[in-house]
């Protein structure tokens, strides 16, 4: 058994942290495979990640944390019964991939305006929650040329579109996704999409 | 009560060995790292071996490193200190104390909150 | 190791007055979690020594609040706002933050 691409390892800097890799050939990864890792602290324990499939030859594991600050770092090992497989280590500061935004909401009953809100996936008490910037990506399925990316660099978890902007008698879709500028983080995974008729008809006298 | 209990100290000749026991009670003792510290006649307090709860991890002062042996059977909430190559040096009063919370990813300290009565070894030919 | 370095060594109190114990290390004991991982410790005569304060700055339980830490990152400061005839014996403070753990050379608090 053999690893063919070592585990990469992706920090929600709250909980989580997300490590996938690939095997040499098909791999029953939660039966044949285990992730260990332990905290490089005092007195700190190992703890086991049992792995699932991705695809044929992939495997992913989620680590469980209590949470994530600067100076931690994990020694990780890939075993295969008795067989040590993989060392590694793994900074999660260093390797941050924010939680998606959720609740991604529009509301088309605020006067030639479509207001997107959306929430922020942090509690305020973790050190990502005032760092996080947006982009909000429209599209419509009516019309296969028109998708935008509306950069949102302020803090607030909101976006305002003139209606008139937007085709009339059509639908659109959004989502939405986040980074920490300050932690040099990855883009999120978009959010879920949320889907809007805009029936906004400028006034007759601008027709 | 949260209670610790050593036992096994006494009269040991350099070289020798002796086994010193802690009895744990009144918590959950498997989720606990615990920790020796000895304290020479007249002298300050010196630690001496910690283990993480699970027993996965020990740490050792230089001074005992390589004589010493820390250890812990959860099912009894018992914890150990083997004591092998004994030293003049080695006499004092040593104390097991409860450390930090170790069952967490990351451990959590309450610092070394319950101390036991002490236990004497005395090296002397 | 990291070095601890307490003073003064020696302590003459008045009851009712107040006292302040000083305990220096040779590196940072602050981890990022914010924690500063330095305890004191009393040890009265006769006894096993019981924790007054954890994480530079947590009383622990049972102790009376005259007792007080503070400090962050290698100076930290023991203070007893009124000493009572009962706070006698000795002082230890100690780096938990990574093994080997090391103590103080003590100071031995005095009723004058």
């Known amino acids: 058994m053999k690893v063919l691409q070592e585990p990469a390892c992706v920090s929600d800097y709250m909980s989580i942290s997300t490590c996938e890799w690939k095997m040499g050939g098909p791999t029953n990864c939660s039966a044949e495979l285990r992730l260990l890792y332990q905290l490089v602290f005092q007195s700190s324990e190992t703890h086991t990640c049992v792995p699932e499939n991705n695809g044929g030859v992939g495997c992913v594991c989620h680590l469980l944390m209590d949470d994530v600050v600067s100076m931690d770092n994990y020694t990780l090992d890939l075993w295969a019964g008795q067989q040590l497989l993989w060392k590694g280590s793994f900074k999660p500061s260093e390797h941050v991939k924010p939680r998606a935004p959720g609740n991604l909401t529009v509301h088309t009953n605020v006067s030639d305006t479509v207001l997107l809100t959306w929430s922020n996936p942090y509690p305020p008490d973790n050190y990502l929650y005032n760092d996080l910037t947006y982009a909000v990506n429209i599209w419509s399925e009516n019309d296969p040329a028109y998708s935008r990316i509306h950069n949102v660099t302020y803090l607030k978890p909101t976006l305002r579109i003139p209606a008139s902007t937007l085709k009339s008698g059509i639908s659109y879709r959004a989502r939405v996704r986040a980074w920490a500028q300050h932690y040099n983080t990855t883009w999120s995974e978009w959010s879920p999409s949320t889907k809007w008729y805009n029936s906004y008809r400028e006034p007759f006298e601008q027709r | 009560e949260v209670q610790l209990v050593e036992s096994g100290g006494g009269l040991e000749q350099p070289g020798g060995s002796l086994r010193l026991s802690c009895a744990g009670s009144g918590f959950t003792f498997r989720d606990f790292a615990m920790t020796w510290v000895r304290q020479a006649p007249g002298k300050g307090l010196e630690w001496v071996s910690s283990v993480s709860g699970d027993g996965g991890n020990t740490y050792y002062a230089d001074s005992v490193k390589g004589r010493f042996t820390i250890s812990r059977d959860n099912s009894k909430n018992t914890l150990y200190l083997q004591m092998n190559s004994l030293r003049a040096e080695d006499t004092a009063v040593y104390y097991c104390?409860?450390?930090?919370?170790?069952?967490?990813?990351?451990?959590?300290?309450?610092?070394?909150?319950?101390w036991g009565q002490g236990t004497t070894v005395t090296v002397s030919s | 190791d990291i070095v601890m370095t307490q003073s003064p060594l020696s302590l003459p109190v008045t009851p009712g007055e107040p006292a302040s114990i000083s305990c220096r290390s040779s590196?940072?004991?602050?981890?990022?979690?914010?924690?500063?991982?330095l305890d004191w410790y009393l040890q009265k005569s006769g006894q096993s020594p019981q924790l007054l304060i954890y994480l530079s700055s947590n009383r622990a339980s049972g102790v009376p609040d005259r007792f007080s830490g503070s400090g962050s990152g290698t100076d930290f400061t023991l203070k007893i706002s009124r000493v009572e005839a009962e706070d006698v014996g000795f002082y230890y403070c100690m780096q938990a933050f990574q093994a080997p753990y090391t103590f103080g050379q003590g100071t031995k608090l005095e009723i004058k």
């Open positions: 590196q940072s004991l602050l981890y990022s979690n914010g924690y500063n991982y």
């Open positions: 104390a409860k450390d930090r919370l170790s069952v967490t990813v990351r451990p959590r300290y309450y610092g070394l909150d319950v």
